[in-house]
Structure formats: structure tokens, C-alpha cells
């Protein structure tokens, strides 16, 4: 019969900092130079040995002769409580078939961390713990004084706890969350009625989780240095100096080197010359509670992203072509660049590829005269893509050109004694075809009936009129305009020696808030287009003149600007345009585009006063200079008599009160004979004109008192 | 009973050095941060320094640092303030003070300080 | 330079209320809990309130703290005449790296 191999010399140390216990122990009787697998059953004790809190097996191989070691973390900090520790072991080897036993348990070991000895009558454990966010955590006091009435906070809250026994009492803190980098606060006070007997407070430090970090990569832009980045995510650093920010170390399991990175999100590795082509790096993330690794595999000539290009320049510049020149650095022999040019200018952006070995070369054409252009260029590896460099640019500016279309010119004519003036009106030209700073406009005046006559005006820019006073001949007028390289197609109108402003009616017409719309007869005859132009009814014809061109076979279109105000009148003519460029006036048209109430009442005279009647007339009243058409007028009539008199109807005012009103339909009948009306009596009146948006501003009734019929006679 | 004694104050010159004590009993020393508090004559409050129970983390005042260190000899219960490069204005009442805990709660003990006068 | 402001006096006659704030930043009361300190003339300052609203046994309920954002106050209800002393909030300020005393206000019972 084999003797029981008892566990012996057993021996418990402790590591308050970990909350552990650390085992160790011989097994006596072991035969020499023999091998056996062994199970040891391990018990532990809180407080006293019959209060077993923990059981547990540990299977191992023995050798004769062994220290066994064995650990065992508390949850519960080791200074809380003494615990106590005993082992006891079986064989569990096939070498040995028959029934095993286990042997005798071990004398319980106490483990006292005494912690608790200075002078203070409380003490809270742990003092300054590291744990990661989500962790469960028991904390624990000891008071002296089992007198003292013990109460205990985190972050200003009181916490209620498990009594171990009278003197101790732990808390069970679960899934602590992160509160400030400084720690989360938790502290007890003892006290005795109102009188405290001290306070202790310990910070329990909580780390946000380590993060894997984000976005490994590594590239190369001279095959001299690897450059690797990565988001690290968030900062796990800890206040009072209690944890650092996590530290980044990268490893190359090729070459087998390592460097510690010195920024938390990048890194530059040495390439060596030693031909490796390909990298497996891994990037291990560790603070002091946990490492995090993420692995990247890649071919070095995969990963090059190449310094910006350099030296970009423009060579023969002319008004519509560019060459565009540029350099890269040559990171190897036979490399070859992809290239990427953009074309920004004039509101467009054009892209453009090319391939090169050494020096970059690119010929831009069709671009816009006196034109600035911004050009960038950015390259790549043509082989292995992998990114683009960043970009490089500059910008150049093609030269003028000569314009390269007509103004576009309109006139107005008005005939006065022996002559015509005639006001010459053009629009600047667009940049598309002004092709450089127009400089001046020469306008050329020929008497198409003196054909060896003919005159030359040149008006600086920015101009764009000019007053001509000319005689009864027909004449033929040039427009141009230049800039420093040449001079535009010419503009040409015709003005007749007929007069042309024979008598067309005036038509009225609504506009709507898009504008107007017109239409008109077409003229007999060839026409090369129509021109229709306005002005505002009540100003200077100079001061807001505007005309579009219609094409020939259009005989309608809206006339739509922002310029169109409420309550203004404009004043519309439409010419026809003959194959002589000479304008026949073919309809005249005049409205709102929206039409406001009047603005004003007329002043009204009393005249004629009898009686039994009385004239008011109101012959000064000027109906051109309204907001709107006036269609007429509204004339209301106050007086004591109940009925109203002929003509007039009975009307309610704004005020509530009732009165009667006549309305006069006739814009231009400005004048009414009010009779039917008592002798001395007293009348009141108010004259008021109307638009298709409504009567004019309400203002004080006139009074009026008649006569007795002696006097009035 | 509670008890922090400050020592080491007096007159000194500009430029010249001074080293304050502070002897604590009445508690377990080694379980509480501890603070140099200075209070110049007729003003406020003016935290100098403090240091940690295990003296892991220590924090200076701007107008301190570089010139004054703070120690601590948890099996002397003695808290220390070495001063150098003395100013004018580094003239007050310097009063030690015990923490509430293991780093910087506040100041719930303190002692009834020692004067240190920097003058020419 | 005090990193923490509070008015240079406050007065009430005996039974007020009076009310001493204390204004700061996000780098302190913003992120720190505040402590409230008194000092008669003379003597050490005393600890008041800590962790922004807790008061120490043998400290009346008539003082009481409270936080919020980056200021603080600090309430004595029923004042009395031994309440007349110099009162001090005070944080921590991470940005300096430094515990910071306010500027102090001298209670004064009428």
C-alpha cells in the first residue's frame, strides 16, 4: 500500500497591488526520478476557516523534488480580510490503476496583509486601483471602532455595502463606467453623533478600453522609409500620473525587428537595403492593462505614394494653348508615373492622364483667350497603383485675342429741327467674347447718301453710349469694339432719312410677376429679326433703356428681369428689322407688371356752389404718373338725409360708418355736379381714384355747407 | 490626535534656499496625499504643492515650478518643501495640510504654519 | 491670477440667507469636484464641504454646496455672527496641473 502523498511546506505570499495569493509547495514521499500526474484540490477561507469561499483543483505533473506553485486572485482587496489557505492532493496517473485517495489536508495557512496598522481608526482598501472600463470591483472599510457609525460615497453618492463582519464591510461596485481621467472618487467617513472621526478617501482609477487600432497602413515615397499611420482611437491616459498613454510598438516578423513608436499614430521604419520586398507588420496597441495588435501584409513596390511633383511651369503661352511642364522625383531606374492633370478655369475642370518617366510634358489646347486657368498635376506608381501624391499646381493666363463677336447695339431716334439725334446704346461684350480688356469702341458713321463721307468716334471703355446728332440723310453706323490685339466684328444699324416714328397706337397691356409677355403682327416684307426695347414710362428714356433681339420668325416673347418693379409703368416698342438693317416701328405697348392702388387723392375745387348744388373738379390731377392704370373715380357723399341721392349708392367706409358713392368710369372725366341738395344744409365729401388693385388712400372728407336759397340767388 | 507641526521657516535672502518640515501624528500617514498651502500677509489662499500617498504623482503651482520640490519619508511620517531661488514674493504664512485621500480630495487637517520672509 | 472668481464680499444681518458663488472653467469646477473652505483671522482654514456637496460631520447643515456646469456656490441659511470669516472655493485645474484656490469673499453679518 503507497503512503498518501501529502502536500507539504506550504507557504502563502501575497501581491496586494494584483489581490493575489501565490501557493507553493513540496510533495513528500515521491519516488526518485518518477514522473506523476497529480490533482491537487486547493481551499480557501475568508475571515474563518469554516467560512470556505473559493474551492478548486489544480492538475499538474510532478517531478520528486518540485516546488509547486499555484495563484489566486481575490476580488475582494487581501487587506479587507485575513484568508487562509489549505491543499490536499490525489494521484491521477495511469501508472497507478488501482483506486486512488486523496490524501490529508494540509494545515490552514493564514494570510494577514496588514495594512491596517497605522494610526487611523478607518481604513479603505484598495487605495489606488487600475481597472478597465466594465469591470466589477469590491471595495471594502475597516473600521477600528465598531462604534463608529460608518458611511461611505462614490462621486458624492452614498453606497450601501455587505457586512464581512463587525469591523468590515465591502461594496460591490458593478461594471464601473469611466467618469473623469483623474479617477472616480469614493470615499468613508466615521463618525460618532455629529463628531467625525475621520475620513478616508481612495480613488478607484477606471481606464477607457484599449481600442485595436484603426486604419493600419504603410507606404513608402523613396523606398528609403516605410511611413505607417493609423487612428489609435481613444486616449486611455489616466490622471496623477497613474497610466500613461498607450504605447505603440511595431513589429516586423520577416526581419523579426521592432521599434517602439514615438507617436501615438504614426511611425517611419527604415527599409534596408537588403532587397525585402515584402513586409508583415504588426502594430500592438499596450497600455497597462491590455495589448491590442492589428497585422498588415503588402508588397513594398505595392505601397509607394509618391512625393507631389515640383517644378510646374507653363511654356509657350498663347491665347489658346499652353504646354505645361513639370518634374518628379526619381525614386528608381525604369519607374514609371501615372499623372493626372486638372484644368480648372472659367467655372469648368478638365482632367487629363498621362504617363511619363522623368520629366513631365502636356499640351493644353482649346483654351478661352485672356483666360486664367489654375493647372494641378499629382502622380503615381503607372505599375502598382496605390495613391495619388498630393497635388501641385500654379496658375497661368492665356493671352488676349481679338473679340470675336459683335456688340450688340441698339439706337433711339428722336426727330427734332433739320436733324436726327440719335442715342447709340450697346451691351459690354461677355468674356467669352471679349477675349481680353476691352480698351475702346470706335463707332463709324457713314452718309449712305454721300458715300465719301464718313466719320470716326472712338469712345474709351467702359462706355456703352453715344449721342449722334445728324442730318436728314440716311446713315449707316459701325460699332467695334478692342482690346490690345484687335478689333471685333463690327455692328452695323441703318438710320433712314424717312422719319420713323410714324403713329402707332399705343396698346396697354398686363404684366405678370414673371414679367411681360408680348406679341405683335409680323412686318411685311423680309425681315433679319425684331428688337423689342423699353424703359420706365415716367423717367429719362437713358436712365434704365433696355432692348432684346427676336429672331425673324418669332413674332412674341417674354420680357422677364428682376429690374421690373411694382407700381412702375414701362413703355415697350417693337421694331422690325428690314434686310437693310434699317428698324420700322411696328407696335407700341405700355403696362405694370404689377399695379398698385393709386398713391395720391386728386386735389378737388369746389365750384359753382348753390343752393341745391355744387361742381367738384379735380382738372390737375394727373393720371400718367400713377402705380397703375386709373380706371376711374369713386366719389363718396355724407349728409343727413337717410336716402341717397340719384346716381349715388349706399357704401360702407373703412370705419365702419355710411355714406353714399358714385363712381365715375371714365379716367379722364374729372369733374361732377353734385345736385338735388337742400338749401342750408351741410354736406361732406371725398374723391378718390381707383387701378384694378384697389382706390386710393383713405383720407378727411371736405365739407361743404349750402346756401340759403336768398343768398344763393 | 490629529496633529501636523511645520518647521523650518525664517528670514532669508533673495536667491538663497530654505527647507520646510512638516511632522505628522495622529494618523497613518501613509494612507493621504499632503499639500504646501502659503498664505501672504492681508491675501488669499495659494496652493504651493502637493504629493500623492506614494508619492506616484506631484503637482507644483505655476509660480513654483522649477524652483521649489516637495518630498515625503512615509517611515518618518515627515512632509518636505525645499525651497530655492527665493523671491520677494514667495514671502507668507506656509501652512501644511492632510488630504481627505490617497491623491487631491481637499484639505481636511492643517497645521498652524510657519512663516517664511524673503528680504534683502 | 486666482483661476477661480468668486465676489470679494457678501454680508446679511442674522437669520438670511446668503449665497457665495464661484466661477470657473471647464478645465476645473467644469471637471473637478469643488471644495469650500472657511478661515476665521488668525487660525488655519478649515474644511467645509468637499466633493462639491458634502459636508464633514460637525459642519451645520446651514452650509450646504452645489455645482453645476462651471460654477459653484456655497449657501449659509440663518447666519450668524460666528459665521463672519473669509470663504474659500477651490478645485482642481487640469489644465494647469494644479489645485486652485478662488479669490475669497469676507462674510460680514450685519
Known amino acids: 500500500e503507497r503512503l498518501p502523498l501529502t502536500p507539504v511546506s506550504l507557504k502563502v505570499s501575497t501581491n496586494s497591488t494584483r489581490q493575489s495569493l501565490h501557493l507553493q509547495w513540496t510533495v513528500h514521499n515521491l519516488p526518485y526520478h518518477q514522473e506523476l500526474k497529480m490533482v491537487f484540490q486547493i481551499q480557501i477561507s475568508r475571515i474563518e476557516t469554516s467560512n470556505v469561499i473559493w474551492v478548486g483543483n489544480y492538475s499538474t505533473t510532478v517531478k520528486w523534488n518540485q516546488v509547486l506553485h499555484w495563484s489566486w486572485e481575490s476580488e475582494l482587496p487581501l487587506e479587507c480580510a485575513t484568508h487562509f489557505v489549505r491543499i490536499k492532493s490525489l494521484v491521477d496517473d495511469a501508472k497507478f490503476p488501482e483506486p486512488n485517495f486523496w490524501s490529508n489536508w494540509s494545515s490552514w495557512e493564514e494570510v494577514s496583509v496588514q495594512d491596517s496598522t497605522g494610526q487611523d481608526i478607518l481604513f479603505v482598501f484598495p487605495k489606488d486601483k487600475l481597472v478597465e472600463e466594465g469591470t466589477n470591483v469590491t471595495i471594502c472599510y475597516v473600521s477600528r471602532n465598531i462604534q463608529n457609525n460608518v458611511s461611505c460615497y462614490l462621486e458624492g453618492k452614498q453606497i450601501h455595502g455587505e457586512q464581512l463582519d463587525p469591523h468590515v464591510t465591502a461594496f460591490n461596485l458593478n461594471s464601473v463606467p469611466f467618469i473623469r481621467n483623474k479617477g472616480t472618487n469614493i470615499y468613508c467617513e466615521a463618525s460618532q453623533g455629529n463628531v467625525s472621526e475621520g475620513m478616508k478617501g481612495i480613488v478607484l482609477f477606471v481606464s477607457k478600453v484599449l481600442e485595436e487600432p484603426k486604419d493600419f497602413s504603410c507606404e513608402t515615397e523613396d523606398f528609403k522609409t516605410l511611413h505607417c499611420t493609423w487612428d489609435p482611437g481613444t486616449d486611455t491616459a489616466l490622471g496623477w500620473s497613474k497610466q500613461p498613454s498607450q504605447s505603440y510598438t511595431l513589429f516586423e516578423s520577416f526581419s523579426g525587428e521592432k521599434k517602439l513608436c514615438t507617436h501615438k499614430n504614426w511611425c517611419n521604419w527604415q527599409i534596408t537595403q537588403d532587397s525585402q520586398e515584402t513586409y508583415n507588420f504588426t502594430l500592438i496597441a499596450e497600455n497597462y492593462l491590455r495589448k491590442r495588435s492589428v497585422n498588415i501584409l503588402f508588397n513594398l513596390t505595392h505601397r509607394v505614394y509618391l512625393m507631389n511633383p515640383f517644378s510646374v511651369n507653363f511654356e509657350n503661352v498663347n491665347a489658346t494653348n499652353a504646354i505645361m511642364t513639370w518634374k518628379v522625383h526619381s525614386i528608381r531606374n525604369n519607374f514609371t508615373y501615372l499623372c493626372q492633370i486638372e484644368l480648372h478655369g472659367e467655372g469648368k475642370m478638365m482632367q487629363y492622364n498621362v504617363s511619363i518617366k522623368v520629366n513631365g510634358e502636356y499640351f493644353l489646347s482649346e483654351l478661352e483667350p485672356a483666360t486664367e486657368y489654375m493647372a494641378r498635376v499629382r502622380c503615381a506608381d503607372a505599375s502598382h497603383f496605390w495613391k495619388w501624391s498630393e497635388w501641385s499646381g500654379q496658375n497661368f493666363t492665356t493671352l488676349e485675342a481679338a473679340p470675336s463677336e459683335a456688340p450688340d447695339v441698339w439706337r433711339i431716334v428722336s426727330l427734332e429741327p433739320g436733324n436726327h439725334t440719335v442715342t447709340l446704346f450697346w451691351k459690354p461684350l461677355s468674356k467669352l467674347h471679349a477675349n481680353g480688356k476691352i480698351l475702346f469702341y470706335n463707332v463709324v458713321v457713314e452718309n449712305l447718301d454721300k458715300p465719301s463721307s464718313s466719320e470716326l468716334h472712338s469712345i474709351p471703355a467702359p462706355a456703352n453710349s453715344t449721342k449722334l446728332i445728324l442730318d436728314r440723310c440716311s446713315y449707316q453706323i459701325c460699332v467695334i469694339a478692342n482690346n490690345s490685339v484687335g478689333a471685333s466684328p463690327a455692328s452695323v444699324i441703318v438710320i433712314s432719312a424717312d422719319p420713323e416714328n410714324k403713329e402707332v397706337e399705343e396698346e396697354r397691356i398686363a404684366g405678370t410677376e414673371g414679367g411681360f409677355s408680348l406679341s405683335w403682327k409680323p412686318q411685311p416684307g423680309d425681315v433679319i429679326g425684331y428688337v423689342v426695347d423699353w424703359c420706365d414710362h415716367t423717367q429719362d428714356v437713358l436712365g434704365d433703356f433696355q432692348w432684346k433681339n427676336v429672331g425673324p420668325n418669332t413674332t412674341s416673347t417674354v420680357i422677364s428681369t428682376d429690374a421690373f418693379r411694382p407700381g412702375v409703368r414701362y413703355d415697350f416698342r417693337i421694331y422690325g428689322l428690314s434686310t437693310k438693317r434699317i428698324a420700322c416701328l411696328l407696335e407700341k405697348k405700355t403696362g405694370y407688371s404689377q399695379e398698385l392702388a393709386p398713391s395720391d387723392n386728386p386735389h378737388v375745387l369746389v365750384d359753382t356752389l348753390t343752393s341745391h348744388s355744387f361742381t367738384l373738379s379735380w382738372k390737375d390731377y394727373s393720371t400718367e404718373s400713377q402705380p397703375g392704370f386709373i380706371q376711374g373715380y369713386h366719389v363718396y357723399l355724407k349728409s343727413k338725409a337717410r336716402q341717397c341721392h340719384p346716381r349715388f349708392e349706399k357704401a360702407v367706409l373703412s370705419d365702419g360708418s355710411e355714406c353714399c358713392k358714385y363712381k365715375i368710369d371714365n379716367p379722364e372725366e374729372k369733374a361732377l355736379i353734385v345736385d338735388n341738395l337742400k338749401p342750408e344744409s351741410f354736406y361732406e365729401f371725398f374723391i378718390t381714384p381707383f387701378t384694378s388693385a384697389g382706390e386710393g388712400p383713405s383720407a378727411t372728407f371736405t365739407k361743404v355747407t349750402t346756401p340759403d336759397e336768398h343768398s344763393s340767388m | 490626535q490629529v496633529e501636523l507641526v511645520e518647521s523650518g521657516g525664517g528670514l532669508v535672502q533673495p536667491g538663497r534656499s530654505l527647507r520646510l518640515s512638516c511632522a505628522a501624528s495622529?494618523?497613518?500617514?501613509?494612507?493621504?496625499?499632503m499639500h504646501w498651502v502659503r498664505q501672504a500677509p492681508g491675501k488669499g489662499l495659494e496652493w504651493v504643492s502637493g504629493?500623492?500617498?506614494?508619492?506616484?504623482?506631484?503637482g507644483y503651482a505655476d509660480s513654483v515650478k522649477g524652483r521649489f520640490t516637495i518630498s515625503r519619508d512615509n517611515a518618518k511620517n515627515s512632509l518636505y518643501l525645499q525651497m530655492n531661488s527665493l523671491r520677494a514674493e514667495d514671502t507668507a504664512l506656509y501652512y501644511c495640510?492632510?488630504?481627505?485621500?490617497?491623491?487631491?480630495?481637499?484639505?481636511?487637517?492643517w497645521g498652524q504654519g510657519t512663516t517664511v520672509s524673503v528680504s534683502s | 491670477q486666482s483661476a477661480l472668481t468668486q465676489p470679494p464680499s457678501a454680508s446679511g444681518t442674522p437669520g438670511q440667507k446668503v449665497t457665495i458663488s464661484c466661477s470657473g472653467s471647464s478645465s476645473n469646477i467644469g471637471s473637478s469636484p469643488v471644495n469650500w473652505y472657511q478661515q476665521f483671522p488668525g487660525p488655519a482654514p478649515k474644511l467645509l464641504i468637499h466633493s462639491n456637496n458634502q459636508r464633514p460631520s460637525g459642519v451645520p447643515d446651514r452650509f450646504s454646496g452645489s455645482k453645476s456646469g462651471t460654477s459653484a456656490s456655497l449657501a449659509i441659511s440663518g447666519l450668524q455672527s460666528d459665521d463672519e470669516a473669509d470663504y474659500y472655493c477651490a478645485a482642481w485645474d487640469d489644465s494647469l496641473n494644479a489645485y486652485v484656490f478662488g479669490t475669497g469673499t469676507k462674510v460680514t453679518v450685519l
Open positions: 495640510a492632510k488630504d481627505i485621500g490617497v491623491y487631491y480630495y481637499g484639505m481636511d487637517v
Open positions: 495622529g494618523f497613518t500617514f501613509d494612507d493621504y496625499a
Open positions: 504629493i500623492s500617498w506614494n508619492s506616484g504623482s506631484i
